[in-house]
């Protein structure tokens, strides 16, 4: 707390300007009117205040707006935003995308802080859903943002927003998240032709079911190994050797290098060795000739 002291004669601030950098903490507290500060917040960012001075300015705003700052002030917080706690931010009602962008700009190049996470949460909740413009903005600042959301939160992403997603935005997503995003992507890109569709849907395929992979195998898509390795194991297992060969096209040779890794390893164990041999890659571990293959899932359903 800064002590309440009278402002020295001639020091009363008539505007927020550079001369205030020379004020001591108690002088800022005594000589800067909170209402003046609120109306001239846009100037604060252009002035080299120290953190100590910014603390005083924040204190003045807190006193003026105990229930939370209005958006007109929030939009111009600039580096003062870094002084806000998540508790402060929870009091805000941020509805403008411009305000969100202005504050994200302040944190640009840094990890997502608790303040930023709280701000985004407030903003998205206020909007009711993660619309395309918001998603565009958030992934531009934080490519990993989408993968930080829970499957439940992702369910509020409308398919139209999927157009804003870039492949790198999905790098850290786990299968549960891709399970939610894939059907939305499929819906979003459904009117595209074969090759264009594959380019767009490729990064979401970690959530694709077997039947969709079978369908893709009929379209000469030439899936690369990196994409194949991210597919759901349970979706890959039912694929035949012929289907995998068609799915991968010229990239099928890459299976040899990955034969000890999932999902390739598990897929090999489900294939007849004869069929694997037709690939000419020397893949080993398939079911020997003459052995009966039981589909356990069918058996379980019958019993």
């Amino acid at each position: 707390e800064v002590e309440k002291t009278a402002c020295p004669s001639g020091k009363k601030a008539r505007e927020i300007d550079e001369s205030l950098i020379f004020y001591k903490k108690w002088e800022l507290e005594a000589c800067v009117d909170a209402a003046l500060l609120a109306t001239q917040m846009d100037r604060v960012n252009a002035i080299p205040f120290t953190y100590e001075q910014l603390d005083v300015l924040k204190h003045k705003l807190d006193e003026l707006y105990p229930q939370g700052y209005p958006e007109s002030v929030i939009q111009h917080l600039g580096y003062l935003f870094l002084k806000m706690s998540p508790e402060d931010i929870r009091k805000w009602n941020v509805t403008s995308l411009e305000t969100l962008k202005a504050l994200l700009e302040v944190n640009k190049g840094h990890e997502m802080s608790p303040q930023v996470a709280t701000l985004i949460d407030r903003f998205v909740k206020g909007r009711g859903q993660l619309d395309k413009d918001t998603l565009d903005t958030l992934t531009a600042f934080y490519p990993g943002y989408l993968c930080s959301l829970s499957p439940e939160e992702l369910s509020s992403v409308p398919p139209s927003s999927i157009w804003a997603v870039r492949p790198q935005d999905l790098d850290t997503c786990d299968p549960r998240q891709l399970d939610v995003l894939y059907p939305k992507a499929r819906l979003a890109f459904q009117n595209m032709n074969g090759s264009e569709y594959f380019v767009k849907i490729q990064s979401f395929l970690g959530g694709a079911p077997t039947e969709d992979l079978k369908a893709l195998s009929q379209q000469n898509v030439s899936m690369d190994l990196a994409t194949f390795m991210k597919l759901r194991t349970d979706a890959v297992l039912p694929l035949t050797v012929a289907e995998v060969q068609k799915l991968l096209g010229p990239h099928v040779e890459g299976l040899k290098a990955e034969e000890r890794h999932r999902p390739v390893r598990d897929w090999i164990l489900r294939q007849r060795q004869d069929d694997l041999d037709t690939l000419g890659l020397g893949l080993q571990g398939g079911i020997p000739n003459g052995y009966l293959v039981l589909d356990l899932s069918v058996q379980e359903a019958l019993s």
Epitope: E18, F22, A46, T50, Y51, V106, G109
Partner: antibody, heavy 119, light 110 residues
Framework: QVELVQSGAEVKKPGASVKVSCKAS????????INWVRQAPGQGLEWMGI????????KYAQKFQGRVTMTRDTSISTAYMELSSLRSEDTAVYYC????????????WGQGTLVTVSS | DIVLTQPPSVSGAPGQRVTISCSGS????????VSWYQQLPGTAPKLLIY???QRPSGVPDRFSGSKSGTSASLAITGLQSEDEADYYC??????????FGGGTKLTVLG
């Protein structure tokens, strides 16, 4: 054109004080802050403090607090930097530099004043 | 205390490209503009880059600045013998107020 002209070299004994001047021309003296920066032989630049020529307000680097005094005389458009209790480590070239508002850059520099502290 | 870290020296042959890095923190580079100064032997520093990447008039476009997060860098392309000098990054620090990097000596080989 903007020019900052500093006083000549000084040789001082340890414990003494030195006062360096910086005369500004080519712009309104009270319109821009003046900073003082020093550079010991073979070393980097070190910010000492800043003065607002308009009101005379100052802000000093913590390291020099209590030993440095920055003043100005608006009638002759001159800023001064006085450093007291000199020691051998204060041997350096002392520069005045104008600070450009809004961008906070040192856009014009004096030619430097060498202060040698030696017994 | 130097809170902006620069390499003590860099070198390059004429015509080459060299970069000088400047590493800081959120209280300086991370929250303010960076400027760069060139100090030729025996002279006062001269402003080279301001506002992270802007060149004052008269500074050749061989000099360029960039910033990302809490680091900044100065790039010099088409190195010339007259570029041999000390280079300082600068910004103001929201803890100590103003700050310079330790400086980098650029040597032009040959």
């Amino acid at each position: 054109q903007v020019e900052l002209v500093q006083s000549g070299a000084e040789v001082k004994k340890p414990g003494a004080s030195v006062k360096v001047s910086c005369k500004a021309s080519g712009y309104t003296f009270t319109g821009n802050y003046i900073n003082w920066v020093r550079q010991a032989p073979g070393q980097g630049l070190e910010w000492m403090g800043i003065i607002n020529p308009h009101g005379g307000d100052t802000k000093y680097a913590q390291k020099f607090q209590g030993r440095v005094t920055m003043t100005r005389d608006t009638s002759i458009s001159t800023a001064y930097m006085e450093l007291s209790s000199l020691r051998s480590e204060d041997t350096a070239v002392y520069y005045c530099a104008r600070w450009h508002h809004g961008t906070w850059i040192f856009d014009y520099w004096g030619q430097g004043t060498l202060v040698t502290v030696s017994s | 205390d130097i809170v902006l870290t620069q390499p003590p020296s860099v070198s390059g042959a004429p015509g080459q490209r060299v970069t000088i890095s400047c590493s800081g923190s959120s209280s300086n580079i991370g929250s303010n503009y960076v400027s760069w100064y060139q100090q030729l032997p025996g002279t006062a520093p001269k402003l080279l880059i301001y506002n992270d990447n802007q060149r004052p008039s008269g500074v050749p476009d061989r000099f360029s600045g960039s910033k990302s997060g809490t680091s900044a860098s100065l790039a010099i392309t088409g190195l010339q013998s007259e570029d041999e000098a000390d280079y300082y990054c600068s910004t103001y620090d929201r803890r100590t107020f103003s700050v310079f990097g330790g400086g980098t000596k650029l040597t032009v080989l040959g």
